[in-house]
């Protein structure tokens, strides 16, 4: 069980990174002059609390910017949205924190992450570029809800 | 109006089981985390353990572990403590109650009125 | 196991400000022990303060707040009313269970 968030990049199988503008991630073309946002990653530690077989539950931050992912309903649709967090507070809780979890699941080099709050939505990005992450009941079709991570350092 | 219900005092012998329920109302039991509490006179209370009723994954306190058994049934709202083996020390009030976060916490916001569990024979 | 110590009674003032403290056996008090302050009033009438060391639950009134204080969790009343006379319990976290103190008996007169 690590005890130190992991920093990854995340790109979609468009070659999409995911970019931090006015406090909301939206995926863009890599570029040149994109600063992609380093994302931290972080084991539930009571993982054995949780759903088996759904992947490994997992809490999303953005390095270095006390900003984690989480996900709450807005009228009766769950949203994704950005909160301010210590990454290491959540980590540490007494009880899994479901609102700020998703279950990483990975299939050769693709990744899903899946709301623990809200099962059967993923984190998604349009296929339109330079779209909002969103979260969708709907995989492969107007979303794409496969990622690729590489860790870093 | 968020209100969790205890079921009534028991008596019951020495070496008998009783099970023991905490029925919510105001919010879903698959939304949070219900907790048990042990409050015996002039002891404070005691951590029994937790239940997540939405995966039945219940954690308990090693004092209380295999006297203890956590359950929940979600179609009805209600959470449960099942006590075994039963002596004269578990004689005590029993509470159930939600450990829910908000924001940026978790607490044990709402509490039952207790059950009062008398083992005599 | 650890065990959580409580001032056993304590009396305050109406409008004063009092402060209840909560330590710990095992070392210092620590943001990570996760301090929970509940209210005990007659006929086993629990509710929820304070969580997370220093968070106050929703419609809790603000003149309850949690903190560190030196070693110790404090819960401070600050302009005690009446209707706070209670047993106070404060529970600790220890990584994979809860510790209550015994209570601390306020008194407001």
């Known amino acids: 069980k690590s005890e130190m968030p992991q920093p990854v990049s995340i790109q979609d199988i468009n070659h999409r990174v995911w970019v931090l503008q006015d406090q909301i991630l939206i995926a863009v073309p890599r570029k040149d002059r994109v600063s992609p946002v380093t994302i931290s990653l972080i084991s539930c530690r009571h993982v054995e609390t949780l759903e088996k077989d759904r992947g490994n539950p997992i809490y999303l931050g953005l390095n270095g910017l006390n900003l984690c992912l989480m996900c709450a309903k807005a009228g009766d649709q769950p949203t994704l949205q950005l909160k301010e967090k210590d990454i290491m507070d959540l980590y540490n809780q007494p009880e899994p924190v479901k609102s700020f979890l998703f279950y990483h699941s990975q299939s050769g080099r693709n990744s899903t992450f899946e709301s623990v709050a809200f099962p059967g939505w993923f984190i998604a990005v349009s296929s339109e570029g330079g779209c909002p992450l969103i979260l969708t009941q709907e995989l492969g079709k107007a979303n794409t809800t496969d990622f690729g991570l590489t860790m870093l350092f | 109006e968020v209100q969790l219900q205890q079921s009534g005092a028991e008596l019951v012998k020495p070496g008998a089981s009783v099970k023991l329920s905490c029925t919510v109302s105001g919010f879903n039991i698959k939304d949070t985390y219900m907790y048990w509490v042990k409050q015996r006179p002039e002891q404070g209370l005691e951590w029994i353990g937790r239940i997540d009723p939405a995966n039945g994954y219940a954690k308990y306190d090693p004092k209380f572990q295999g006297k203890a058994t956590l359950t929940a049934d979600t179609s009805s709202n209600t959470a449960y403590l099942q006590l075994s083996s039963l002596t004269s020390e578990d004689t005590a009030v029993y509470f159930c109650?939600?450990?829910?976060?908000?924001?940026?916490?978790?607490?044990?916001?709402?509490w039952g009125q207790g059950t009062t569990l008398t083992v005599s024979s | 196991q650890a065990v959580v110590t409580q001032e056993s009674a304590l009396t305050t003032s109406p409008g004063e400000t009092v402060t209840l403290t909560c330590r710990s056996s095992s070392g210092a008090v620590t943001t990570s022990n996760y301090a929970n302050w509940v209210q005990e009033k007659p006929d086993h009438l629990f509710t929820g303060l304070i969580g997370?060391?220093?968070n106050r639950a929703p419609g809790v009134p603000a003149r309850f707040s949690g903190s560190l204080i030196g070693d110790k969790a404090a819960l401070t009343i600050t302009g005690a009313q009446t209707e706070d006379e209670a047993i106070y319990f404060c529970g600790l976290w220890y990584s994979n269970h809860w510790v209550f103190g015994g209570g601390t008996k306020l008194t407001v007169l």
């Open positions: 109650a939600r450990f829910h976060w908000y924001d940026s916490a978790f607490y044990f916001d709402f």
């Open positions: 997370g060391t220093n």
